[in-house]
Amino acid sequence: DYKDDDESRTETQPPVTNLSVSVENLCTVIWTWNPPEGASSNCSLWYFSHFGDKQDKKIAPETRRSIEVPLNERICLQVGSQCSTNESEKPSILVEKCISPPEGDPESAVTELQCIWHNLSYMKCSWLPGRNTSPDTNYTLYYWHRSLEKIHQCENIFREGQYFGCSFDLTKVKDSSFEQHSVQIMVKDNAGKIKPSFNIVPLTSRVKPDPPHIKNLSFHNDDLYVQWENPQNFISRCLFYEVEVNNSQTETHNVFYVQEAKCENPEFERNVENTSCFMVPGVLPDTLNTVRIRVKTNKLCYEDDKLWSNWSQEMSIGKKRNST
């Protein structure tokens, strides 16, 4: 298809040829093309391309362009040729090639498809059935990421209230670039009656750590010492903790943000692998104090999406005064 756009027309360069589009994995869309026929011999060919909404303009010498995109909507790429990297140079007539999502009734597609990466060890996805689906629909979730050779089918389908879901192992690998990539997700039904739904989950977002585990509470003078086990798999610069202390007598509710802290005081069991410690000042030892802790990822490691871990199990120390 030619986009005969006055702004884009140039007399010198013919359009690219054989522009085609294909899908790899679940959501990797690839366009390829051939150089224009009859290009000027003194022209060092560059290709100008952008998506249908004039987004992501690119000028490059390669005769291919790819994008990772959930194929829930039609997506088009326009490509032209030119003789320099100059964005102000008008490229040839732009050629356009589009790819449409799989066919099906849009009302049958699942909705609210979202995934959470739990403790960098498994991913749990959930969705709601589409409006035009039968209650006995059997769903299948497929997933792919860079460390997999092929698309995998998720085996652990479950139901929680109105939501359906599936979880699969996804362990952070040591490769430093692992988290720069995404997981591609597709949900459809076994019978092929519903329109497939796609999602792309960046591995830098929607990370939910496991809750910490409180190991020990102790008093020293009027200070309360709290020791806990950190969730596995995270490096210390990527987490912080919220320690909540409730006092039964004063009915106060104190919240402290805590950096992962070494257990250096003699009150703590020292040098225990993967534990953190914190001293809560000014706590009354002769009253009942209940502590719980939760943890959150640092925005500089994982994009902020407001996901705290669940709270740890509570632990109490001190004695509850009899009300007289």
């Epitope: 640092n298 500089l300 999406d305």
Partner: antibody, heavy 118, light 104 residues
């Protein structure tokens, strides 16, 4: 007591290089981020970037990426901010500050005034 | 990129009055990451509030922070002479442009 002590004021010419420092004490230097904040004369605060001295992982604000380099030497508990070629527009007060993982700056250095003028 | 907009630009009040400073984010942010600072002329900024509502060490209880989502507030319940300064909100890589609290 947590302290961040910065190197003294600098007067430089455009095109010259510069490295200013920030020495931390009174806490575990490798367990907190160190950030750099610019304040141009009569203006507000600008977040430049941060470094985690424990593993030298750095993050820059897009506005400062490629313009400055942040580094740290954990053996002497010191962080650095450097320029390879100064411009007149780099004239400003530069603060270092300690940053816990929740992103606020809880302790600040006294500031280093950098003046770039021909 | 998130933009933090502070209002008003300048607040003219008398000692003993209540000051209410606003910080609005261009998109919803986690309150865990919202901080407030005070800066006096010729001095480094000082952290007042972190996590939107937790007072930093040594900060008097006349300073309080609240809010969630896109709207955050710093309140100074009774202005003392030493509170007249510029106040900034911050969320990781972004600072607001500042609110100057001056003596009326």
């Amino acid at each position: 007591e947590v302290q961040l002590v910065q190197s003294g004021a600098e007067v430089k010419k455009p095109g010259e290089s510069l490295k200013i420092s920030c020495k931390g004490s009174g806490y575990s230097f490798t367990s907190y981020w160190i950030g750099w904040v610019r304040q141009m004369p009569g203006k507000g605060l600008e977040w430049m970037g941060v470094i985690y001295p424990g593993d030298s992982y750095t993050r820059y604000s897009p506005s400062f990426q490629g313009q400055v380099t942040i580094s740290a030497d954990k053996s002497i508990s010191t962080a650095y901010l450097q320029w390879s070629s100064l411009k007149a527009s780099d004239t400003a007060m530069y603060y270092c500050a300690r940053m816990p993982n929740w992103g606020s700056f809880d302790y600040w250095g006294q500031g280093t005034l950098v003046t770039v003028s021909s | 990129e998130i933009v933090l907009t502070q209002s008003p630009g300048t607040l003219s009040l008398s000692p003993g009055e209540r000051a209410t400073l606003s910080c609005r984010a261009s998109q919803s942010i986690s309150s865990s990451y919202l901080a407030w600072y005070q800066q006096k002329p010729g001095q480094a900024p000082r952290l007042l509030i972190y996590g939107a509502s937790s007072r930093a060490t040594g900060i008097p209880d006349r300073f309080s922070g609240s809010g969630s989502g896109t709207d955050f507030t710093l309140t100074i319940s009774r202005l003392e002479p030493e509170d007249f300064a510029v106040y900034y909100c911050q969320q990781y890589e972004t600072f607001g442009q500042g609110t100057k609290v001056e003596i009326k």
